[in-house]
Amino acid sequence: NKILVKQSPLLVVDSNEVSLSCRYSYNLLAKEFRASLYKGVNSDVEVCVGNGNFTYQPQFRSNAEFNCDGDFDNETVTFRLWNLHVNHTDIYFCKIEFMYPPPYLDNERSNGTIIHIKEKHLCHTQSSPKL
């Protein structure tokens, strides 16, 4: 039995910071879990990961290239990424694994979320000299 996950298909970011919510068809408070966020079509890079259960709030840790934190309630894990750059634009996949108690459960691969980080253009206004 695979768990289903819902993600927003697209997030356009112009503030260098984004919150991505992963909504699961399973009660997160029922078991001990490992929630992670992966970057890339083949989920090559583990961006952020947190372990949690019903008795403690998870500690999220990030890949060296990213800054992340997270939070969860009974059906949603929310990853917050900041200091994002244009080259972080990519598709991101939510993953969850329920380890304890058995049986092991994980989610069906979702369609992912394209996070598009907009380039910041600095506007230099031509100032007229005072007469």
């Epitope: 001990e32 490992r34 694994e97 380890m99 304890y100 108690p101 058995p102 049986p103 092991y104």
Partner: antibody, heavy 120, light 111 residues
């Protein structure tokens, strides 16, 4: 037929590191449904769980060893590894790898074990 | 961590005897009606061998003289009629929570 074969044991200096291998056959380490744990047994003592790796590559470790241990695998060789650092005399033990299925997490297949002796 | 306490630590018995070993967990190891408590047999110089899984299910190939019972925190391994090959050390193990833990073992010796 499922088989697990450990190797890499021997005499190690205190403060040194060990890297043990567990070659699996009869099942794939990267296919869903099974994971593998490392378990050790000091001479004349009971069994101590070290940690585990799931088919996904996710790992869990014993809190008492977490800072010194890494479990990894090479899917192309269907082999599991245990790296243990900063070795001390009390790490002297027979090290086993054992497979578990995802329904109950009982250890249904075990390797023969490999002895690691930490001594100067 | 969940502590598992086995009793007795050792026992002497004769061939044909009925032997009972108990395992007590520091908290319940039940989830959705399943007890995540398993029993292993270990002979000197050998790896442990799974006997009973999920408290009462007999592992394939294990003789029917071995049985397990219990739920929650109290579990029992019974050997109905001890055979010469049964002299060994027996361990219980829980997989309800990480870290997985084992009992300290019960050594069954010849009287």
């Amino acid at each position: 037929e499922v088989q697990l074969v450990e190797s890499g044991g021997g005499l190690v200096q205190p403060g040194g590191s060990l890297r043990l291998s567990c070659a699996a056959s009869g099942f794939s380490l990267s296919t869903g449904g099974v994971g593998v744990s490392w378990i050790r047994q000091a001479p004349g003592k009971g069994l101590e769980w070290i940690g585990e790796i799931y088919h996904s590559g996710s790992t869990y470790y014993s809190p008492s060893l977490k800072s010194r241990v890494t479990i990894s695998r090479d899917n192309s060789k269907n082999t599991l590894y245990l790296q243990l650092n900063s070795l001390r005399a009390e790490d002297t033990a027979v090290y086993y790898c054992a497979r578990y299925e995802y329904d109950y997490y009982d250890f249904d297949y075990w390797g023969q074990g490999t002895l690691v002796t930490v001594s100067s | 961590d969940i502590q598992l306490t086995q009793s007795p630590s050792s026992l002497s018995a004769s061939v044909g005897d009925r032997v009972t070993i108990t395992c007590r967990a520091s908290q319940s190891v039940d989830f959705h009606g399943i007890s995540f408590l398993h029993w292993y047999q270990q002979k000197p110089g050998k790896a442990p061998k799974l006997l009973i899984y999920a408290a009462s299910s007999l592992q394939s190939g294990v003789p029917s003289r071995f049985s397990g019972s219990g739920s929650g925190t109290d579990f029992t391994l019974t050997i109905s009629s001890l055979q010469p090959e049964d002299f060994a050390t027996y361990y219980c193990q829980q997989s309800y929570r990480s870290p997985r833990t084992f009992g300290q073992g019960t050594k069954v010796e010849i009287k």
